[in-house]
């Protein structure tokens, strides 16, 4: 807390200029009017000041606006942004997503802070949902956004908004979130061709279920390994050998590397060796032949 | 450029443990397997176990029955590799080896880890 | 597990000269399954043939490998002074992976 002091003589702030950057904290405290600082947002980023002169600043601004900061002040806050805290944004309605773009610019580069997760928390909640517009930004400053979402929270994305998304912008994402964004992927994608359609919703795949594996596996998709592997085992597990041959195509022959991997084990696990025998692989681990395989899961089912 | 950059050097004493992380840049993670593969004092190479980045899922060299755990960090792009009751005979250099999912040879080496264990 | 077993131990050649070195399985490795690596002093491995036969990306020409089932070769052609270092194989046809304990080709 800065002591109150009167403003020496000649030293009162007309505008927010380089000048100020020679006050020391008290002056800076006595002598900048918080309304001309608030009118004058843009220029702070301009100016040198040092951390301990940005606290009076921010200080000034803070009485100014017990309630919370208008938008036009937010959106000028440049550096000062890194100053503010969680509960300091909180008290913020964000409706502009140039404002936003503005504030997360002041964090490029750097992990997502609490400041900035409370920002956007506030900025989604504000909006309602989660719009193409906003995860286009979001996701270019932090590709690994969606994926911080809970699948509550990605249930409000709208499938026109699954365009914006890139496959790196969901590589953290586990089963659970991809189980809610594939059937919106899905939808968003239903009316492009099948080649097209597979480069899209490839990044989605661990979420499909079983009867869209099969349907996939009929069209000349040649899924990679990597795609393959990121699949739900439950999903897998009932396809034959001809659908995960039809599946991969030429690149079938790399369940070899990674039978020793979920799903890939567990799927060979299921399989009989005569029907493995027949990739040529040397996969091992199938049902020998002359046993009887019973679907006690089938039979609890009946019963 | 694609890189995998190791940890320092480490000494250690016998029953304690070490953890050397591998951090990659310049490629898409999840795509590749991370393997690990030592290699003893004026000695051959030796696998030691592989990860999948994408789901975490591990596959380890029976020899090293429960002592190797590896683990990834997606956020950073690094793998980690623990050996625990380390002996002196786990005394060598461990390379992490890039392997593209789906193929069984490593394209791309770390630097090496010196791993000494002495009392 | 399966074990290779690389000969000679060590090979003593001249710049120019052709190098052949072997590989052998203690049982069948798929061909797909087999690589070859180079190793100098103090530097980490580098892959040099992937699938028995295929080249890797920026190896020279002059390197070559060829073998089915038990029996493999990795060849150079003429030897580069760059060449003369420590080379092992390695399968992944048969789990624990394996690598062969080397062979060494040093300046005559």
């Known amino acids: 807390e800065v002591e109150k002091t009167a403003c020496p003589s000649g030293k009162k702030a007309r505008e927010i200029d380089e000048s100020l950057i020679f006050y020391k904290k008290w002056e800076l405290e006595a002598c900048v009017d918080a309304a001309l600082l608030a009118t004058q947002m843009d220029r702070v980023n301009a100016i040198p000041f040092t951390y301990e002169q940005l606290d009076v600043l921010k200080h000034k601004l803070d009485e100014l606006y017990p309630q919370g900061y208008p938008e036009s002040v937010i959106q000028h806050l440049g550096y000062l942004f890194l100053k503010m805290s969680p509960e300091d944004i909180r008290k913020w309605n964000v409706t502009s997503l140039e404002t936003l773009k503005a504030l997360l610019e002041v964090n490029k580069g750097h992990e997502m802070s609490p400041q900035v997760a409370t920002l956007i928390d506030r900025f989604v909640k504000g909006r309602g949902q989660l719009d193409k517009d906003t995860l286009d930004t979001l996701t270019a400053f932090y590709p690994g956004y969606l994926c911080s979402l809970s699948p509550e929270e990605l249930s409000s994305v709208p499938p026109s908004s699954i365009w914006a998304v890139r496959p790196q912008d969901l590589d953290t994402c586990d089963p659970r979130q991809l189980d809610v964004l594939y059937p919106k992927a899905r939808l968003a994608f239903q009316n492009m061709n099948g080649s097209e359609y597979f480069v899209k919703i490839q990044s989605f795949l661990g979420g499909a279920p079983t009867e869209d594996l099969k349907a996939l596996s009929q069209q000349n998709v040649s899924m990679d390994l990597a795609t393959f592997m990121k699949l739900r085992t439950d999903a897998v597990l009932p396809l034959t050998v001809a659908e995960v041959q039809k599946l991969l195509g030429p690149h079938v022959e790399g369940l070899k590397a990674e039978e020793r991997h979920r799903p890939v084990r567990d799927w060979i696990l299921r399989q009989r060796q005569d029907d493995l025998d027949t990739l040529g692989l040397g996969l091992q681990g199938g049902i020998p032949n002359g046993y009887l395989v019973l679907d006690l899961s089938m039979q609890e089912a009946l019963s | 450029e694609v890189q995998l950059v190791q940890s320092g050097a480490e000494v250690k004493k016998p029953g304690a443990s070490v953890k050397v992380s591998c951090k990659a840049s310049?490629?898409?993670?999840?795509?590749?397997?991370m393997d690990w593969v030592r290699q003893a004092p004026g000695q051959g190479l030796e696998w030691m176990g592989d990860?999948?980045?994408?789901?975490?899922?591990?596959i380890y060299n029976q020899k090293f029955n429960g002592r190797v755990t590896m683990t990834e960090d997606k956020s950073t792009s690094t793998v980690y590799m623990e050996l625990s009751s380390l002996r002196s005979e786990d005394t060598a250099v461990y390379y992490c080896?890039?392997?593209?999912?789906?193929?069984?040879?490593?394209?791309?080496w770390g630097q090496g880890t010196t791993v000494t264990v002495s009392s | 597990e399966i074990v290779l077993t690389q000969s000679p131990a060590t090979l003593s050649l001249s710049p120019g000269e052709r190098a052949t070195l072997s590989c052998s399985a203690s049982?069948?490795?798929?061909?797909?399954?087999l690589s070859w690596y180079q190793q100098k002093p103090g530097s980490s491995p580098r892959l040099l043939i992937y699938r028995t036969s295929n080249l890797a990306s920026g190896i020279p020409a002059r390197f070559s490998g060829s073998g089915s089932g038990t029996d493999y070769t990795l060849t150079i052609s003429s030897l580069e002074p760059e060449d003369f270092a420590v080379y092992y194989c390695?399968?992944?046809?048969?789990?624990?992976?394996?690598f062969g304990g080397g062979t060494k080709v040093e300046i005559k």
């Open positions: 049982s069948s490795v798929i061909s797909s399954y």
């Open positions: 390695h399968q992944w046809s048969s789990f624990p992976y394996t």
């Open positions: 310049g490629y898409t993670f999840t795509d590749y397997n």
């Open positions: 990860i999948n980045p994408s789901t975490g899922g591990t």
């Open positions: 080896a890039r392997r593209r999912i789906g193929t069984g040879y490593f394209d791309v």
